[in-house]
């Protein structure tokens, strides 16, 4: 039994890091493998993560972490029974994938303005709370070409757009994702999408 692709990990910089790897053949990850992890400065026994299958030869493990600070460095040991298959380390702050924003809501009752709001996925005491920026994706269910991205580079989790920038009388969907420049993170997953019917009063044309 050998590791074909070494574990790569990403952290949500809050409580979970996710590690994925591939074995050289079909593997029952949860019964055959264990991923042990521990902060390098601690002298307590390492935590044990029981991996799940992620395709035939792929494994994924969700490492629980109480708190994360930028200096944290974890040792990682991948075991198959008494055999050490791979040994490495992981610094969560260097591999951050933020949590996805939630509670995306479209408010359509503000004159002819659409107000989109969502929730910051981090609590106020987390470092990323004040460092997230967002991308909002709006698209038409009827017209695949009607697809747009709005970059929200301010901290407030909201976006205002004129309803008239979208077509009237058709349905749109929106979703939002986050990233943090300070840790050069990857983008989060997209939030669940929300749907609304876009309608607004056409301005009277004067002849």
């Amino acid at each position: 039994m050998k590791v074909l692709q070494e574990p790569t990990c990403v952290s949500d910089y809050m409580s979970i890091s996710t590690c994925e790897w591939k074995m050289n053949g079909p593997t029952n990850c949860s019964t055959e493998l264990r991923l042990l992890y521990q902060l390098v400065f601690l002298l307590s026994e390492a935590h044990t993560c029981i991996p799940e299958n992620n395709g035939g030869a792929g494994c994924v493990c969700h490492l629980l972490m109480d708190d994360v600070v930028s200096a944290d460095n974890y040792t990682l040991d991948l075991w198959a029974g008494q055999q050490l298959l791979w040994k490495g380390s992981f610094k969560p702050s260097e591999h951050v994938k933020p949590r996805a924003p939630g509670n995306l809501t479209v408010h359509t009752n503000v004159s002819d303005t659409l107000l989109l709001t969502w929730s910051n996925p981090y609590p106020p005491d987390n470092y990323l709370y004040n460092h997230l920026t967002y991308a909002v994706n709006i698209w038409s269910e009827n017209d695949p070409a009607d697809f747009r991205i709005y970059n929200v580079t301010y901290l407030e989790p909201s976006l205002r757009i004129a309803a008239s920038t979208l077509k009237s009388g058709i349905s749109y969907r929106a979703r939002v994702r986050a990233w943090a420049q300070c840790y050069n993170t990857t983008w989060s997953e997209w939030s669940p999408s929300t749907k609304w019917h876009n309608s607004y009063r056409e301005p009277f044309e004067q002849h």
Epitope: F41, L42, L43, S44, H47, D66, D67, D125
Partner: antibody, heavy 119, light 107 residues
Framework: QVQLVESGGGVVQPGRSLRLSCAAS????????MHWVRQAPGKGLEWVAV????????YYADSVKGRFTISRDNSKNTLYLQMNSLRAEDTAVYYC????????????WGQGTLVTVSS | DIQMTQSPSSLSASVGDRVTITCRAS??????LAWFQQKPGKAPKSLIY???SLQSGVPSRFSGSGSGTDFTLTISSLQPEDFATYYC?????????FGQGTKVEIK
């Protein structure tokens, strides 16, 4: 709940030896690094030593290096501090403390045991 | 060894006051800083770890901040039970070291 009970303190002459014990309960002792911290009368806290969960690694403060030895018996859930060549400046209350696991830190502490080095 | 210097060494304050205690490390400690409270004749009690993480059960009036070498413990509104001595501790590298303590007394 976690409980740490130190014992073995007392009055000892300079140059003599003493062994402190710490009985642990309420948690999986064999899984945690354990520390000794001391406090001289009316003074601040001083970290003394640490031992890894399996006893394979130990670290000491410079002030006790070569004189004190930290050890553990996981079958008895007990931590030890062997103190040799004791000096007057070793007079203190000695606390044993459980290491955190990336979360709760040095909590709770035992009630401590007083070591007095005096002729 | 890393030296930890607290200031002030003592302070007098009244109930309801906002109190700030600072701790300076002789070199960067990567936010591996803890704060402890100790009352006379009692064992220390953990308040904060990793610079700003509140120990379970500790009131939210206690908060920690800082980075690099300079750190702060703040009590937003001092309560009668908060009169005690406070210690910082670095656990970035062995030997782990404590500050000399700050005694918070009643004015």
């Amino acid at each position: 709940q976690v409980q740490l009970v130190e014992s073995g303190g007392g009055v000892v002459q300079p140059g003599r030896s003493l062994r402190l014990s710490c009985a642990a309960s309420g948690f999986t002792f064999r899984s945690y690094g354990m520390h000794w911290v001391r406090q001289a009368p009316g003074k601040g806290l001083e970290w003394v030593a640490v031992i890894s969960y399996d006893g394979s690694q130990t670290y000491y403060a410079d002030s006790v290096k070569g004189r004190f030895t930290i050890s553990r018996d996981n079958s008895k859930n007990t931590l030890y501090l062997q103190m040799n060549s004791l000096r007057a400046e070793d007079t203190a209350v000695y606390y044993c403390v459980k290491e955190g696991r990336s979360g709760s830190w040095f909590d709770p502490w035992g009630q401590g045991t007083l070591v007095t080095v005096s002729s | 060894d890393i030296q930890m210097t607290q200031s002030p060494s003592s302070l007098s304050a009244s109930v309801g006051d906002r109190v700030t205690i600072t701790c300076r490390a002789s070199q960067a400690i990567n936010n591996y800083l803890a704060w402890f409270q100790q009352k006379p004749g009692k064992a220390p009690k953990s308040l904060i770890y990793a610079t700003s993480s509140l120990q379970s059960g500790v009131p939210s009036r206690f908060s920690g901040s800082g980075s690099g070498t300079d750190f702060t413990l703040t009590i937003s509104s001092l309560q009668p039970e908060d009169f005690a001595t406070y210690y910082c501790q670095q656990y970035n590298s062995h030997p782990w070291t404590f500050g000399q303590g700050t005694k918070v007394e009643i004015k």
